[in-house]
């Protein structure tokens, strides 16, 4: 799995995407490592 | 609105050092990684290396191991590339890029930022 | 490094019609490309993310496909604003490396 920063950036943005955006509001790119997808 | 906005162009001196501002606005600047990519005169796009602006953390692409040093200033939403050692090799433009997922799902760049190096 | 290879540097079409570009990775990244959009004096422009998705904005004209090595951009309906050089960016491992690019011209 591609553990990069913009890999996990478009990760996180299509859980958001799919969650309707309902996740803590810390959880962002830069605060979040690749173990939490 | 998001908005990258690069410092303006650069003639310096072989040997001497520059750095480089990229001021972020119209989204929360610590959110998103920082890209730094170079553009020599028609030639293709390298990429530098990334921060991390919540707190620091770098990654550098090999090549650009000791001639780049990337820095942030959370107070102002500005990212920095201090440059050193500067030869003709290094007259380009640089672009600083972030992909943001609010307000706006993008990759966005900056303006770029000119750089000439010649004695 | 992973070595992004466009071989085409330029590629000639007319108002209208539909090209495709190409792109070639020297090992497998899977999905993880994009493409930008440079035009002449201007900061290159997203177009799409993980080889197929666009940016918000990017007309539907501009599709990608592929994964693995292999990927393509094709621009349908081509218009004179199209006008344009376009690179390939894989960011599946670091460090992140972008195709040469492929200069489109209208005819």
């Known amino acids: 799995s591609c553990n990069t920063a913009t890999c996990v950036t478009h990760r996180l943005a299509g859980l958001l995407s799919r969650s309707g955006g309902v996740v803590k509001d810390n959880f962002v790119p830069t605060n979040v490592g690749s173990e939490a997808f | 609105e998001v908005q990258l906005l690069q410092s303006g162009p650069e003639l310096m001196k072989p040997g001497t050092s520059v750095k480089i501002s990229c001021k972020a606005s119209?989204?929360?600047?610590?959110?998103?990684?920082m890209n730094w990519v170079k553009q020599s005169h028609g030639k293709s796009l390298e990429w530098i290396g990334d921060?991390?602006?919540?707190?620091?953390?770098?990654t550098y692409n090999q090549k650009f191991k000791g001639k780049a040093t990337l820095t942030i200033d959370k107070s102002s939403s500005t990212a920095y590339m201090e440059l050193r050692s500067l030869t003709s090799e290094d007259s380009a433009v640089y672009y600083c890029?972030?992909?943001?997922?609010?307000?706006?799902?993008?990759?966005?760049w900056g303006q770029g930022t000119t750089l000439a190096v010649s004695s | 490094d992973i070595v992004m290879t466009q071989s085409q540097k330029f590629m000639s079409t007319s108002v209208g019609d539909r090209v495709s570009v190409t792109c070639k990775a020297s090992?497998?990244?899977?999905?993880?490309v994009a493409w930008y959009q440079q035009k002449p004096g201007q900061s290159p422009k997203a177009l799409l993310y993980?080889?197929?998705y666009r940016y918000s904005g990017v007309p539907d004209r501009f599709t990608g496909s592929g994964s693995g090595t292999d990927f393509t951009l094709t621009i349908s309906n081509v218009k004179s604003g199209d006008l344009a050089e376009y690179f390939c960016?894989?960011?599946?491992?670091?460090?992140?490396?972008f195709g040469g690019g492929t200069k489109l011209e209208i005819k």
């Open positions: 890029a972030s992909i943001t997922i609010v307000p706006l799902y993008f990759d966005f």
């Open positions: 119209g989204y929360t600047f610590t959110d998103y990684y």
């Open positions: 921060v991390n602006p919540n707190n620091g953390d770098t």
């Open positions: 090992q497998n990244v899977g999905i993880n």
């Open positions: 993980s080889a197929s």
């Open positions: 960016q894989q960011y599946n491992t670091y460090p992140y490396t």
